[in-house]
């Protein structure tokens, strides 16, 4: 079974800069899985942001402008990266990665 670790406990960024969050996958080949990213804003329900499927297809939350969140998958390091562009106050949240084993 796959195991996920998010090595960064927290990340602090200056407004308008770029944040990159990592999710390390072990116990399974990352390219044979779909990785999902979610966020939980303070006082709000958890929300899907973006995913990358086993075949490389990216799907985002339809209500968020394309380009805001970017997802990547690096097989060499078995890592998925969530990039948050143009960081704003609205991005203050806890971010979670999740795995779907195909």
């Amino acid at each position: 079974a796959g195991h996920l670790e998010q090595p960064q406990i927290s990340s602090t960024k200056t407004l308008s800069k770029t944040a990159r969050l990592e999710c390390v996958v072990s116990g399974i080949t990352i390219s044979a899985t779909s990785v999902y990213w979610y966020r939980e804003r303070p006082g709000e329900v958890i929300q899907f942001l973006v995913s990358i499927s086993y075949d490389g297809t990216v799907r985002k939350e339809s209500g968020i402008p394309s380009g805001k969140f970017e997802v990547d998958r690096i097989p060499e390091t078995s890592t998925s990266t969530l990039t948050i562009h143009n960081v704003e106050k609205q991005d203050i949240a806890t971010y979670y990665c999740a795995l779907w084993e195909v």
Epitope: T18, T57, V58, R59, K60, E61, S62, G63, I64, P65, S66, G67, K68, H85, N86, E88, Q90
Partner: antibody, heavy 118, light 106 residues
Framework: EVQLVESGGGLVRPGGSLRLSCEAS????????MIWVRQAPGKGLEWVSS????????YNADSVKGRFTISRDNAKNSLYLQMNSLRAEDTAVYYC???????????WGQGTTVTVSS | SYELMQPPSVSVSPGQTASITCSGD??????ACWYQQKPGQSPVLVIY???KRPSGIPERFSGSNSGKTATLTISGTQAMDEADYYC?????????FGGGTKLTVL
């Protein structure tokens, strides 16, 4: 059938204002991010503004910052573009488009023409 | 600011293969889309995420993207494919379009 219909275009003097509307039907408008794109006569496509479904993310092209304001009313299935301090170079066909979850703009309106001239 | 460069025009004979290029810094790391626009009509998405076709788009349309160049390929080009084609990508939260390429089917 997914449909977007723009309105509100017309002839306006330099320095004047105009408000464009885009009415959506055939899909759950409140779930989608939307954009405005314009096309000057004989020229290419130029992005103008983007807005998230809940209006918490708003982005504008440098060429319209401080002059144009994008907004939406999900209860009315409508997207708006308030254009102030209009210039001759704002003359264009203005399109609204839906921001697809698979990355790309998959549905476009027919466009509304804005002419800025004295 | 980020720019996408396209050739102003490309010509092709009916039944032949047309290739339209789009170049930009690190474009291969971004998700490229292509739009077709016929005179007096609105743009239509023909390729998304480098090489995927929306439903209803003929199989003769394909795309690729690597390095600094994205390419739209139309195999067995038909007269109805004559149009302007625009590439598009995102630079952070900014939407960027190429200048457009007029495809002429001779």
């Amino acid at each position: 059938e997914v449909q977007l219909v723009e309105s509100g275009g017309g002839l306006v003097r330099p320095g004047g204002s105009l408000r464009l509307s885009c009415e959506a039907s055939g899909f759950t408008f409140s779930s989608y991010s939307m954009i405005w794109v314009r096309q000057a006569p004989g020229k290419g496509l130029e992005w103008v503004s983007s807005i998230s479904s809940s209006s918490d993310y708003i982005y504008n092209a440098d060429s319209v910052k401080g002059r144009f304001t994008i907004s939406r009313d999900n209860a009315k299935n409508s997207l708006y573009l308030q254009m102030n301090s209009l210039r001759a170079e704002d003359t264009a066909v203005y399109y609204c488009a839906r921001d697809w979850e698979l990355l790309g703009f998959d549905c476009w309106g027919q466009g509304t023409t804005v002419t800025v001239s004295s | 600011s980020y720019e996408l460069m396209q050739p102003p025009s490309v010509s092709v004979s009916p039944g032949q293969t047309a290739s339209i290029t789009c170049s930009g810094d690190k474009l291969g790391d971004k998700y490229a889309c292509w739009y077709q626009q016929k005179p007096g009509q609105s743009p239509v998405l023909v390729i998304y995420q480098h090489n995927k076709r929306p439903s209803g788009i003929p199989e003769r349309f394909s795309g690729s993207n690597s390095g600094k160049t994205a390419t739209l390929t139309i195999s067995g080009t038909q007269a109805m494919d004559e149009a302007d084609y625009y590439c598009q990508a995102w630079d952070s939260t900014t939407v960027v379009f190429g200048g457009g390429t007029k495809l002429t089917v001779l």
